[in-house]
């Protein structure tokens, strides 16, 4: 059995040239004619040179999985799904996303260092000493309040709470 070259496929004991992306095999090669290819029908595709008798079905972006269609399927390219705003892709297979997760909400004591995108979760960072954050989508930690000369510091600030001052 012959081993075929790259971008050829085996038919019986003959090697046939593959079809171009966007096409599938309509008729395998013979003594005098090469591979006869046919364009992929709507909602199907082939992304690479291939020896397929049928094109592959285009992917569908499931809104229930937090997905939206970013790029429609073409005869040579599968549908590209992206996560809806506020979500990022957890499972990426090439250019295809199968599951999305909601962006992490930064907990109290942390700020948003890098906002979440369609393919990356939010990155949180701790507040430095002398600052605090209630968490959420806050991008800057706020400096603790300095109690005035007429106020007394009741409770020192933490990374998640401000200083408490009393006016007694």
């Amino acid at each position: 059995q012959p081993s075929c070259r790259q971008e050829e496929f085996l038919v019986g004991d003959e090697c046939c040239p593959m079809c171009n992306p966007g096409y599938h095999v309509k008729q395998v090669c013979s003594e005098h004619t090469g591979t006869v290819c046919a364009p992929c029908p709507p909602q199907t595709y082939t992304a690479h040179a291939n020896g397929l008798s049928k094109c592959l079905p285009c992917g569908v972006c499931d809104p229930d999985m937090g997905l939206l269609t970013w790029q429609e399927c073409s005869s040579w390219k599968d549908t590209v799904c992206r996560c809806i705003p506020g979500y990022f892709c957890e499972n990426q297979d090439g250019s295809h996303c199968s599951t999305c997760l909601q962006h992490t909400t930064c907990p109290p004591g942390q700020r948003v260092e890098k906002r979440g995108t369609h393919d990356q979760d939010t990155v949180c960072a701790d507040c430095l000493t002398g600052t605090f954050s209630l968490g959420g989508t806050q991008e800057e930690c706020l400096p603790w309040t300095n109690c005035s000369a007429f106020q007394q510091e009741v409770r020192r600030g933490t990374n998640s709470t401000d200083t408490t001052c009393s006016s007694q």
Partner: antibody, heavy 116, light 108 residues
Framework: EVQLLESGGGLVQPGGSLRLSCAAS????????MNWVRQAPGKGLEWVSI????????TYAQKFQGRFTISRDNSKNTLYLQMNSLRAEDTAVYYC?????????WGQGTLVTVSS | EIVLTQSPGTLSLSPGERATLSCRAS??????LAWYQQKPGQAPRLLIY???SRATGIPDRFSGSGSGTDFTLTISRLEPEDFAVYYC??????????FGQGTKVEIK
């Protein structure tokens, strides 16, 4: 003797239409796939379209899809190419050629000039 | 689509010399490659099909070799009538059938 004779070329304005014909003789026309190939002045060969022997399957190079239509009349041993929405860059000699793979016989060509 | 690249663009030789023309495909076309000769004001004429088979009536000084991506047309001894433009064409995977850009064989 196999003969292919194109006709129908000429001067046409941009946006206009033209129908080329290719009269075949000397072989069983209805048994062969037929092609149109064009050649712009001073340039190389460019495949345009193919039609199968019975005429029920046609294929085009992507750039001609929608503008050009290949057809055949096996009772008249004639191949046709209907060209619409012609552009200056369609100026070329248009050849009909016989064959599914290698093209073993060619006509002498007909010149199509698209100009205002 | 499969792109065919012919080299050299022009070949300047004298009658009686050997001409070697090259055609390279961007991916494998198997054995499904043809060579054509075209003279000014004339239609192309099929010389070689299936990479190595001579078409009807073609003199045996014309020969083809190669498979996959690399092909050669050899004219063993150039005759005056052989000075012309030569095109390779793949039909390994179609549509589209594609042609090389041509090699001109001129008299030195």
């Amino acid at each position: 003797e196999v003969q292919l004779l194109e006709s129908g070329g000429g001067l046409v304005q941009p946006g206009g239409s033209l129908r080329l014909s290719c009269a075949a003789s000397g072989f069983t026309f209805s048994s062969y796939g037929m092609n149109w190939v064009r050649q712009a002045p001073g340039k190389g060969l460019e495949w345009v379209s193919i039609i199968n022997p019975s005429g029920d399957t046609t294929t085009y190079a992507q750039k001609f899809q929608g503008r050009f239509t290949i057809s055949r009349d096996n009772s008249k041993n004639t191949l046709y190419l209907q060209m619409n929405s012609l552009r200056a860059e369609d100026t070329a000699v248009y050849y009909c050629a016989r064959g599914r793979g290698a093209f073993d016989y060619w006509g002498q060509g007909t010149l199509v000039t698209v100009s205002s | 689509e499969i792109v065919l690249t012919q080299s050299p663009g022009t070949l300047s030789l004298s009658p009686g010399e050997r001409a070697t023309l090259s055609c390279r495909a961007s991916r494998s076309v198997g054995k499904y490659l043809a060579w054509y000769q075209q003279k000014p004001g004339q239609a192309p004429r099929l010389l070689i099909y299936g990479a190595t088979s001579r078409a009807t009536g073609i003199p045996d000084r014309f020969s083809g070799s190669g498979s996959g991506t690399d092909f050669t047309l050899t004219i063993s001894r150039l005759e005056p009538e052989d000075f012309a433009v030569y095109y390779c064409q793949q039909y390994g995977s179609s549509p589209p059938v594609t042609f090389g850009q041509g090699t001109k064989v001129e008299i030195k």
